[in-house]
Interface confidence: low
Amino acid sequence: SEVEYRAEVGQNAYLPCFYTPAAPGNLVPVCWGKGACPVFECGNVVLRTDERDVNYWTSRYWLNGDFRKGDVSLTIENVTLADSGIYCCRIQIPGIMNDEKFNLKLVIKPAKVTPAPTRQRDFTAAFPRMLTTRGHGPAETQTLGSLPDINLTQISTLANELRDSRLANDLRDSGATIRIG
């Protein structure tokens, strides 16, 4: 079943997805799509990476982490109720039927008068088999591409905590990793 994530109207939604590249420059294509993961590819693609770079995105969908280190978590900016639904993160590992597929359910709630960020209580459930990579932050080499900065001032507590290196280390040490190669 899908892991559920919540955000309020007007906030940014964060959908985590990670893998560990075999080598820093040896990337695996990844696609994000609206709707559950189909047999192949992603339906209704909102963002896609290839072996080198991000080659497609639409304006409210960003990779805020260092995708060159395998952080392909998706941020959706300024969400509306229409953004609710299932999202597919597909790590397109070479070979027949090797892809790793993750369905993440996004629930958008109406904005409160005084917004209070919701806390993700179960970190294990939040990262089913997705934990990994040592990269949380800007690209190490700015001659290589990434994606534009986004408005994270209202992002959820979980997403902010993920940026804390100690938490990232704790999560990394907790086990499951998709390791490519």
Epitope: W57, G137, A139, Q142, S146, L147, P148, N160
Partner: antibody, heavy 119, light 107 residues
Framework: QITLKESGPTLVKPTQTLTLTCTFS??????????VGWIRQPPGKALEWLAF???????RYSPSLKSRLTITKDTSKNQVVLTMTNMDPVDTATYYC???????????WGQGTLVTVSS | DIQMTQSPSSLSASVGDRVTITCRAS??????LNWYQQKPGKAPKLLIY???SLQSGVPSRFSGSGSGTDFTLTISSLQPEDFATYYC?????????FGQGTKVEIK
């Protein structure tokens, strides 16, 4: 080698519209994740980010100036154009054209062009 | 918007001195912090990106550190060409914002 150069009027009158052009070389705005945009600096003051446009035509504006700004690109001419309406003397500043990759720093800058707003 | 506050606003130092400039963000910005050097009449020049990564061609006497809300730019041994104004800038959220600058003057 990446270079950027700003061009446009040096003097505009209050209420007029400012049009600045950034002409660049050494990279293409058709490359994924590349952005070109504008940062200004009033005399003796700090830097202020204005607007950016990315390779996929996504546009980002300063919230405080959004209603006055329009940014466009002409990929074939390697140019980015910024228009700023209803100019005021407080808009007197050096306007810089800058390059960035994705969320990264502003790694290349034009020499800047001083725009004075005065009647 | 995220506010960036630099300190001091100016400082006087001598050639060979170790100089430290601090930058504080109004909220956590992880490592999304860049430093620029600007000389009078010139465009800013990128020195450090991602809090601690040295931009290509920048002398190794420049270094950056910090994460979250507090950041530091250090010049290990000040050289004559280092007298300038230094700005920090966050790229964690839109709009990117700059500090007010720190002017490094000759003592």
């Amino acid at each position: 080698q990446i270079t950027l150069k700003e061009s446009g009027p040096t003097l505009v009158k209050p209420t007029q519209t400012l049009t600045l052009t950034c002409t660049f070389s050494g990279f293409s705005l058709s490359t994924s994740g590349v952005g070109v945009g504008w940062i200004r600096q009033p005399p003796g003051k700090a830097l202020e980010w204005l607007a950016f446009i990315y390779s996929n035509d996504d546009k980002r504006y300063s919230p405080s100036l959004k209603s006055r700004l329009t940014i466009t690109k002409d990929t074939s001419k390697n140019q980015v154009v910024l228009t700023m309406t209803n100019m005021d003397p407080v808009d007197t500043a050096t306007y810089y054209c800058t390059h960035r990759r994705g969320w990264g720093p502003f790694d290349y800058w034009g020499q800047g062009t001083l725009v004075t707003v005065s009647s | 918007d995220i506010q960036m506050t630099q300190s001091p606003s100016s400082l006087s130092a001598s050639v060979g001195d170790r100089v430290t400039i601090t930058c504080r963000a109004s909220q956590s910005i992880s490592s999304y912090l860049n430093w620029y050097q600007q000389k009078p009449g010139k465009a800013p020049k990128l020195l450090i990106y991602a809090a601690s990564s040295l931009q290509s061609g920048v002398p190794s006497r420049f270094s950056g550190s910090g994460s979250g809300t507090d950041f530091t730019l250090t010049i290990s041994s000040l050289q004559p060409e280092d007298f300038a104004t230094y700005y920090c800038q966050q790229s964690y959220s839109t709009p990117p914002t700059f500090g007010q600058g720190t002017k490094v003057e000759i003592k």
